[in-house]
Structure formats: C-alpha cells, structure tokens
C-alpha cells in the first residue's frame, strides 16, 4: 500500500486549512491551555504492525471529523474552510481504508489494536469534555484547534515512518 504519496499532501493541506481557521488572537487564550494527554506512545509506531498503525491514524482522523462536524463547531468556524477541512479528512479516511483493505491477509497480526483505538477515543473524549466544561467558548476552540494541529503534525511523523517501512 502506497499510503504516504496520496496521504501526506492531504495531511499538509489539512494543517494549512486549520492554520487559517483561527477567528480570535490566540494570545488572549493563554490561560485556557489544557493538558489533554496526547497519547504519544500510540503514534511512535515502533510496537505496531503496519495495519495497526493505519487503524490508529484512521481513528484519529475519524474522531477529528466527528469533533469538527458538530453543531457547536459549525457555529464557530468559517463554513467555507470547514467544508475544505471535511473534504481533506474524507480523502484521508478513504486512503486509509483502501490501505487497510490491502493489508488484509498480508500480516499475521490483527488489523486493529483495540487498546490503541480506545486510547485515541479517550483522548478525544477528554477534548470534548474540556469544550463542554468551557461552554464551547472561542478560546476553548482555539486551544482545541492548536491541539489537533499538533496531533496531526505528530501523526505525520508516524506516516513518514510507515513510508520508510515500505
């Protein structure tokens, strides 16, 4: 599966779109910083077979899609940018799903690491809880946007390692 060729450009575009999404000065939001406990170990990629790494990436993108496609998100961000964002995420999900299908039967290990998937879900639950507690304030969304950009950057590192494993 030749994932990164089709995927890394879309990942870069996603980051660029997120960078443009800011509505308020982040300098006014410093005190809203929060430790979401990004599951770094799930993106180190050392303990994974390729299919499992792909499933973790897929879960992260799916959860990001879910997070940004809520009513509260739509009320916060520019509609045109959100649509572009959805398109890129959808493209990445399709790429990863196609890759996962190609990996079926290639490796003896399971396609999915259930513990890793749950860890990613819990991470997004913490983000959603934070937004709820902050009543989806503009600053809370700014902090979340910064966190998701960081997690996408870190996941790009995993994709790069996957490409080198090809």
């Amino acid at each position: 599966c030749d994932l990164p060729q089709t995927h890394s450009l879309s990942n870069r575009r996603t980051l660029m779109i997120m960078a443009q999404m800011g509505r308020i000065s982040p300098f006014s939001c410093l005190k809203d910083r929060h430790d979401f406990g990004f599951p770094q170990e799930e993106f180190d990629g050392n303990q994974f077979q390729k299919a499992q790494a792909i499933s973790v990436l897929h879960e992260m993108i799916q959860q990001t899609f879910n997070l940004f496609s809520t009513k509260d998100s739509s009320a916060t961000w520019d509609e045109t940018l959100l649509d572009k964002f959805y398109t890129e995420l959808y493209q990445q999900l399709n790429d990863l799903e196609a890759c996962m299908m190609q990996e079926v039967g290639v490796e003896d290990t399971p396609l999915m690491n259930v513990d890793s998937i749950l860890t990613v879900r819990k991470y997004f639950q913490r983000i959603t809880l934070y937004l709820t507690e902050k009543k989806y304030s503009p600053c809370a969304w700014e902090v979340v946007r910064a966190e998701i950009m960081r997690s996408f950057s870190l996941s790009a590192n995993l994709q790069e390692r996957l490409r080198r494993k090809e």
Partner: antibody, heavy 121, light 107 residues
Framework: EVQLVQSGAEVKKPGESLKISCKGS????????IGWVRQMPGKGLEWMGI????????AYSPSFQGQVTISADKSISTAYLQWSSLKASDTAMYYC??????????????WGQGTLVTVSS | DIQMTQSPSSLSASVGDRVTITCRAS??????LNWYQQKPGKAPKLLIY???SLQSGVPSRFSGSGSGTDFTLTISSLQPEDFATYYC?????????FGQGTKVEIK
C-alpha cells in the same frame, strides 16, 4: 536538531535604527511562537513581546509597546526585533526563545545565543 | 500584570547541600510556572515547566512543586555546575513576567 541562531553584536549611536534577527531551524517554524527577552547589564530577564510566525500576530509587554517592533518572515524562518530610534538605555543582551503557543508543552524550551546591543555616543 | 517575587535574592551553599528557592505570584496562576537556570554569558536554560514537569535532559536532582500562588524549586544535592542564577516565570497570562532571580553562590 532545534536551533535558534541570532544575528551578531551591534554597536550603535543614539537615534539610530536597528533590526536584529533570530533564525529557527530543525522544527516547524510556524508551529511555535517566538518571544523576545531583554537582559540589561547585571540585571534580570524581562519579557518584551511575542509573535506567532504563522500569521504575524503579536503581543507586547506594556513596558515595550511602542518602543520596539516584532516581525517575522516565515518563508525564511526568521523573527525580528527592531528599533526606529535607539536610546542609551536600550543597551542590553536580547534573546529570542520559542514558545509552544496554546499547546501544553514546555515554554521557552530553546533559546537563541543572544544579541548584544550597545548604544553609545 | 502578574508580579513574580523570588526569595531569597541570593544564597550561599556548599556542594551536596539541599537548596530551596521560592517564587510567589501576585495572583493565582494555577500551575503555569517555569524555572530557568542562567550561567554568566549564557542564555537561560529551561529546567521545570508547568510547576513540576522536568524538562528533557535536566538532571533529576532538580524538582519543582506548588500551584496557585506559591512555588518551589528544589535542588536535592547541589553540584558544582549548579552555581548559577535561577529565574521563575509565569506563563498563565500576558504579559509574561519573570521573577527577579536568585543567585546561588559557593559558600
């Protein structure tokens, strides 16, 4: 390897203008803010201001607002600190340092080596 | 602005001593407090961030504690290379502010 490399020492006369630089490498320059810190001879650290290189948004300490201008050129991963009219009291060591922005990560984890600015008639 | 007050402003200690430096904020800053070490002619170096997290590569003899307004930097067993000036800095809100520094000298 993450590095912030600052421009060399400057000797200027009062009333002259100056622009010093801080070039980032080894990381995504637009993913971190760049802060500037002053240290006058034999004194402590004073935060001057900060810039988000992704969109050049800035914030200044009230003590330095209107006294200096912070800017950045993301195409060459460089931040700048400038004065339009230097005073003898601007004599100091100036440091740049990177800041993680709104991310929960270490503040000012990498620093430039410092630029010594001497203003004397 | 949030004022940061360090104490003592200087102290003399011997190698092997346990050293404690305190930092007080003029208002609650949660745990948004960093500690830096600076040696003469050098740039500051981050030791502790978010009050108690040890920065990568920093020896474990350095530790930080506190929240709200009162914070502490502890060096469990002072080493020759630890003689320097230490600064606290709040990262809770702009403008960011530093303490005035604590100089740790050889007794």
């Amino acid at each position: 390897e993450v590095q912030l490399v600052q421009s060399g020492a400057e000797v200027k006369k009062p009333g002259e203008s100056l622009k010093i630089s801080c070039k980032g490498s080894g990381y995504s320059f637009t993913s971190y803010w760049i802060g500037w810190v002053r240290q006058m001879p034999g004194k402590g650290l004073e935060w001057m201001g900060i810039i988000d290189p992704s969109d050049s948004d800035t914030a200044y300490s009230p003590s330095f607002q209107g006294q200096v201008t912070i800017s950045a050129d993301k195409s060459i991963s460089t931040a700048y600190l400038q004065w339009s009219s230097l005073k003898a009291s601007d004599t100091a060591m100036y440091y740049c340092a990177r800041h993680p922005g709104l991310n929960w990560a270490p503040d000012f984890d990498y620093w430039g080596q410092g630029t010594l600015v001497t203003v004397s008639s | 602005d949030i004022q940061m007050t360090q104490s003592p402003s200087s102290l003399s200690a011997s190698v092997g001593d346990r050293v404690t430096i305190t930092c007080r904020a003029s208002q609650s800053i949660d745990r948004a407090l960093n500690w830096y070490q600076q040696k003469p002619g050098k740039a500051p170096k981050l030791l502790i961030y978010f009050a108690s997290s040890l920065q990568s590569g920093v020896p474990s003899r350095f530790s930080g504690s506190g929240s709200g307004t009162d914070f502490t930097l502890t060096i469990s067993s002072l080493q020759p290379e630890d003689f320097a000036t230490y600064y606290c800095q709040q990262s809770f809100d702009f403008p960011l502010t530093f303490g005035q520094g604590t100089k740790v000298e050889i007794k």
